[in-house]
Each structure stands twice: as C-alpha cells, then as structure tokens.
Interface confidence: medium
C-alpha cells in the first residue's frame, strides 16, 4: 500500500491556508475535485468541490473555502480564509472518477490553527493590496455523496449514515464578497 504522507502547517487564527494539490494533467484536467477533512475513525467529509466537469481557473466558494482548478498547470488551489482553531485537522484533495473510488492526491495536510492575533498578512483586512473578488456567479457545486473507505484513519463508520452530505459539513461561516487573501500561505 502507498504510504500516506502528511505536511504540517501551523497558522494563527485569522490567517489563510493557501495550498495546492498537483494532479496528472492529461488524466484529470476536467475531473471534479474535492477538498475533504478526515476525522479519526470517520469517513472523509467533503467540504467543497469543483463543478462537474471542473471549469478552468473558475473559483468555487463554499463558506470560507475557495477552490480554483488550473487545468493548464495540473493544480488545484485550495484556500481556507479566516482560519479558526476548530479548523485544525487532517485534510486531503481528491479527484472524483465515478464509478471508481475517488483518487487521493498527495500529500495530506495537517493543519494546526492556534489562537492569537498573528500580525502576519492573511490575519487581517490589510493583508494584501490586491483585493481578491469572488465573482457573484460563484456557486456551491454539488458534491458526490460517496467517499473512499481507503482513507479511513481508524475504524470505519458503523453505517452509511455516517457518510456526510454537503449540508452536514463542519460549520464554515460565510465570508463577504470581497476577501483579502495572501498568496503564499
């Protein structure tokens, strides 16, 4: 079996996690992609996903999560803005490829969010001069209901009722139409 590797990010409340997941261009460019959280002993929960088929560099926003799929570069950009301590956890990017199980992209991301104003860009409103505007047309894409049992971290759930739908995600409050976000973190 492939060893599951993790990358750890330690950020302060209010900062932005800004990471990318690489994928094989030819194979997955237009495939639907998702950002998931993995809780111990549970199936991965899908927090946000791109449209189906995935649109090139078209931002999809779900609460404080913004996904952008750069087809020409084989990367999915994932941002979680205004981080909260409760956002700490293990995350992964996956590619939906029905009828097969989702394909997991490496590495997983171990996010540690700690309290306290960091004073670093991403933590407040003047973090960057370029204002990133979420287009008003940005919609919440419908995400498939299935997840992969291969990514369970401990025991699998007792029944399929534990598999989350997009509406039973962790609580991510909505942000305003204008979000100032850093580029590198």
């Amino acid at each position: 079996a492939t060893k599951l590797t993790e990358e750890k990010y330690e950020l302060k409340e209010g900062q932005t996690l800004d990471v990318k997941c690489d994928y094989t261009l030819e194979k997955f460019a237009s495939s639907q992609k998702a950002w998931q959280i993995i809780r111990d002993g549970e199936m991965p929960k899908t927090l946000a996903c791109t449209e189906r088929p995935s649109k090139n560099s078209h931002p999809v926003q779900v609460g404080r999560i913004i996904l952008e799929d750069y087809h020409d570069h084989g990367l999915l950009r994932v941002r979680m803005v205004n981080l909260q301590v409760e956002d700490s956890g293990l995350y992964q990017c996956v590619i939906y490829q029905p009828p097969k199980e989702p394909h997991m992209l490496f590495d997983r991301i171990r996010l540690v969010v700690t309290k306290g104003f960091s004073g670093t860009p991403g933590s407040n409103e003047n973090s960057t001069q370029n204002v990133y505007k979420i287009p008003p047309t940005t919609t919440k894409a419908l995400c498939p209901l299935y997840t992969s049992p291969r990514t369970v971290t401990q025991a699998p759930p007792k029944s399929t009722a534990d598999v989350s739908t997009p509406d039973s995600e962790i609580n991510l409050t909505n942000v305003t139409d204008i979000i100032r976000v850093p580029v590198f973190n």
Partner: antibody, heavy 127, light 107 residues
Framework: QVQLVQSGAEVKKPGSSVKVSCKAS????????ISWVRQAPGQGLEWMGG????????NYAQKFQGRVTIAADEPTSTTYMELRSLRSEDTAVYYC????????????????????WGQGTTVTVSS | DIQMTQSPTSLSASVGDRVTITCRAS??????LAWYQQKPEKAPKSLIY???SLQSGVPSRFSGSGSGTDFTLTISSLQPEDFATYYC?????????FGQGTRLEIK
C-alpha cells in the same frame, strides 16, 4: 532551472521612486513564485514581498505596505518591484529570488524557500 | 511576526572542523525553514529547504535538522570555501522572516 537577471544600479533622490526589473529565463515563468529581498549595507536580509505570476496577486511585508508594488508581466517573464517615497535608509542591494512551487510529488506549499537569486541591484538614495 | 534568532552571531573555526549553527523561531513553524550562505558582494545561495532537504548541487557536508521551533545547520568538515555568513529563514507564515545571520570566520 530558472535564471534571474536584474536591471542595473540606480541612484535616486529622496522622495522619488525606483523600479527594478527581474527577468526570468530557462524555466516556466508562472510555475515560480518571485520574492523581493533587500539588504542594507552591512545588514541582514529583509523580505519585502512576493508574487506568483500564475495567480497575479502580490503580497507585501507590513513594513512596505502602501509603498511597494510588485507586478509580473507573463509575456516577457519579467517581475517588477517599485518602491516609492524613497528615503536614505532605502539604500540597499535589492534581490529578486525564485521559489519553485509546482510539480507532482512536491510540497503542497507554494513557497519553498528562495532557491534561485538574481545578481542584485544596488539602489542608492542620496540628495 | 515570527522572530528568528540565530546563534552564535559569529564563529571562528578551522578547516576540517565540525560546525553547528542554531536557529530558533518565536513560534512553531513545522519544518518550513531554509538555510542560506552568503559571501561578500554576492547574492545568497540556498543550501537547505524544508529544514533538512539539501538543495541540488550543495555538498553533502551541509545538513539541516529540527522542526517546530529549534533548528540546526551542521557543516561536518569545514572547507576553505565555507567561510561566509549563514542565514536561516522561516516560510511557515507571512511575513517571511530571516535570522540576523551567523558570520563564520577562519580561526
């Protein structure tokens, strides 16, 4: 691997602006993040800001916020750093540096550390 | 901002010596740390990224270790060309910050 070539030395008056360019060659321009770092005479390194050309948005250190603009021109693979309202303490060597952030199996982070540096541009601010 | 503190600030050593430079972050930065070497009138050169990964083309006598807040750069056997100033740098979060530098001189 990408190479970075910077524009030549500049002598400026206090209150004026300077625009330094950094041209990349030998790599895919928008697969890198470009940072600007300065070093005053006899001092250490100070990060000013950076840009990922693919995404277009720049980010700046709070100290330089409102006084610096970093921009990228993809067709010419060139990044620019403009510093306004110059004062004598801005006298320094200004470096651009590239961070490779793309590739299968690489880090999820965009920013790796500054793996390739330009030769530096000396900016002297004097009346 | 994350403060990076290097020690010592200067160091005298001889060719063949084993040298260790430490860098401490004011808060946890996982493994998001890089080390650079700079010689007078030259641009810095990247030695180590992600705390312990050697940049391509850098001699294996250079090594890095640590995670969280405490990091170390080790030169196992000093060569004449290694006398320079060394900087650590964090890139866990903005603003990216450097240590104040460690000047390595010939004894």
């Amino acid at each position: 691997q990408v190479q970075l070539v910077q524009s030549g030395a500049e002598v400026k008056k206090p209150g004026s602006s300077v625009k330094v360019s950094c041209k990349a060659s030998g790599g895919t321009f928008n697969r890198h993040a470009i940072s600007w770092v300065r070093q005053a005479p006899g001092q250490g390194l100070e990060w000013m800001g950076g840009i990922i050309p693919l995404f277009g948005t720049a980010n700046y250190a709070q100290k330089f916020q409102g006084r610096v603009t970093i921009a990228a021109d993809e067709p010419t693979s060139t990044t620019y750093m403009e510093l306004r309202s110059l004062r004598s303490e801005d006298t320094a060597v200004y470096y651009c540096a590239s961070s490779y952030f793309y590739g299968s199996g690489s880090s999820n982070y965009y920013y790796y550390g500054l793996d390739v540096w330009g030769q530096g541009t000396t900016v002297t601010v004097s009346s | 901002d994350i403060q990076m503190t290097q020690s010592p600030t200067s160091l005298s050593a001889s060719v063949g010596d084993r040298v260790t430079i430490t860098c401490r972050a004011s808060q946890g930065i996982s493994s998001w740390l890089a080390w650079y070497q700079q010689k007078p009138e030259k641009a810095p050169k990247s030695l180590i990224y992600a705390a312990s990964s050697l940049q391509s083309g850098v001699p294996s006598r250079f090594s890095g270790s640590g995670s969280g807040t405490d990091f170390t750069l080790t030169i196992s056997s000093l060569q004449p060309e290694d006398f320079a100033t060394y900087y650590c740098q964090q890139y866990n979060s903005y603003p990216i910050t450097f240590g104040q530098g460690t000047r390595l001189e010939i004894k």
